[in-house]
């Protein structure tokens, strides 16, 4: 009869929803355990760079304070090249005074 | 009849299976592009992680070559000055000579 | 003896990159600090610039750029990147530091024309 | 920048005449302030270091003062051969080191 008929054809609608339905529940539990290993990964990563960022910060004022301890002993060295030259010109001329003595 | 109020049941069924299936579509839709979004921002944290070592690693081997030029200064330094001293002492003692002389 | 003394002078094109050399008797550039000074003809002198004894390079400001100043054990150089005719001039080598130049070449004169 | 101002630039002085040189830097160089003297065809020689010591073998007529940005150099009795262009050459902390534009001293 019509009704057999439609009923048969409602149960394999049915059936066919019901079976999408936990195709999709499965497909979501895996896009959500996806998500979540995502976001897991993601938070590691951002500590990773926090991490990262404050040591190269570190790294960064650390050869800031190298370059002027550098700049100042390279300072430091050519105030002695002057102060070496100054002693060798009294030098000589202590020696030139002896020599006339 | 049994048969209309099956059929009704059976309606109702599929009516909230079909419900179901699209709140379950809606979810994964909106589960689906979380994770994109996850995704995508833990590839560019991921970036950002090489990029920071990178730069990282390369403030470390210039700490590590300022330090060693530091060293290396910090002897001209005390070797110029050893160096200023003898020469002080030279010209003290020429001195004295020439006063003894 | 203690001296220091200038290569010989040479005649340039302008553009054409020139090394002069400064060459040391008697004493050593590990303990002491080396300049080159400039003198056009009948003006005054110019400081171009200086190294010290490790290494440390120092130029006048007009000078940074135009001119490289590099040492090896027994010899300091002076390198013109790119002459210019305002660049003929004597070019004295000296040694010390600061304001300080006891020892110093007799000069060497360069002449950039073309 | 440093800037060394010299004067005067040219002067004439007849033999046992007092002649003073000024130099004024555009900064305080806290006495790194050396004068020379140059004669023509030579390199220049140094007098004075350290804006009043004088150098090897330079006669004690010439005399060199002054501190901060001002500095003299003074020759007291002068001879005929302190005829010669003058010099200051200044340096700062930073080692910028700048030539006064020359004194040319003439003797009468």
């Known amino acids: 009869t019509a009704n057999s008929v439609a009923c048969r054809d409602g149960l394999r609608a049915q059936a066919e929803c019901r079976n999408t339905t936990h195709l999709l529940q499965r497909q979501l539990t895996r896009t959500q355990d996806s998500l979540l290993q995502a976001e897991t990964q993601a938070n590691s990563c951002n500590l990773t760079v926090v991490t990262l960022q404050e040591s190269l910060e570190k790294k960064v004022s650390q050869a800031l304070e190298q370059q002027a301890r550098i700049k100042e002993l390279e300072n430091e060295v050519t105030k002695l090249n002057q102060e070496l030259e100054n002693l060798r010109i009294q030098k000589e001329t202590s020696s030139t005074v002896q020599v006339n003595s | 009849t049994a048969n209309s109020v099956a059929c009704r049941d059976g309606l109702r069924a599929q009516a909230e299976c079909r419900n179901t299936t699209h709140l379950l579509q809606r979810q994964l839709t909106r589960t689906q592009d979380s994770l994109l979004q996850a995704e995508t921002q833990a590839n560019s944290c991921n970036l950002t992680v090489v990029t920071l070592q990178e730069s990282l690693e390369k403030k470390v081997s210039q700490a590590l070559e300022q330090q060693a030029r530091i060293k290396e200064l910090e002897n001209e330094v005390t070797k110029l000055n050893q160096e200023l001293e003898n020469l002080r002492i030279q010209k003290e003692t020429s001195s004295t000579v020439q006063v003894n002389s | 003896a203690q001296s220091v003394k200038e290569s010989e002078g040479r005649l340039v094109t302008p553009g054409t990159p020139l090394t002069l050399t400064c060459t040391v008797s008697?004493?050593?550039?590990?303990?002491?600090?080396m300049s080159w000074v400039r003198q056009a003809p009948g003006k005054g002198l110019e400081w171009i610039g200086l190294?010290?004894?490790?290494?440390t390079t120092y130029y006048a400001s007009w000078a940074k750029g135009r001119f490289t100043i590099s040492k090896t054990s027994t010899t300091v150089e002076l390198k013109i990147t790119s002459p210019t005719t305002e660049d003929t001039a004597t070019y004295f080598c000296?040694?010390?530091?600061?304001?300080?130049?006891?020892?110093w070449g007799q000069g060497t004169l360069v002449t950039v024309s073309s | 920048e440093l800037v060394m101002t010299q004067t005067p630039s040219s002067t004439s002085t007849a033999v046992g005449d007092t002649v003073t040189i000024k130099c004024q830097a555009s900064?305080?160089?806290?006495?790194?302030l050396a004068w020379y003297q140059q004669k023509p065809g030579q390199p220049p020689k140094i007098l004075i270091y350290?804006?009043?010591n004088l150098a090897s073998g330079v006669p004690s007529r010439f005399k060199g003062s002054g501190s901060g940005t001002e500095y003299t150099l003074t020759i007291s009795g002068v001879q005929r051969e302190d005829a010669a262009t003058y010099y200051c050459?200044?340096?700062?902390?930073?080692?910028?080191?700048?030539f006064g534009g020359g004194t040319e001293l003439e003797i009468l």
């Open positions: 900064q305080s160089i806290g006495s790194n």
């Open positions: 350290s804006a009043s």
């Open positions: 190294i010290n004894s490790y290494g």
């Open positions: 008697g004493f050593s550039l590990s303990n002491s600090g």
């Open positions: 000296a040694r010390g530091a600061g304001s300080s130049y006891g020892l």
């Open positions: 050459l200044g340096s700062d902390s930073s080692w910028d080191t700048v």
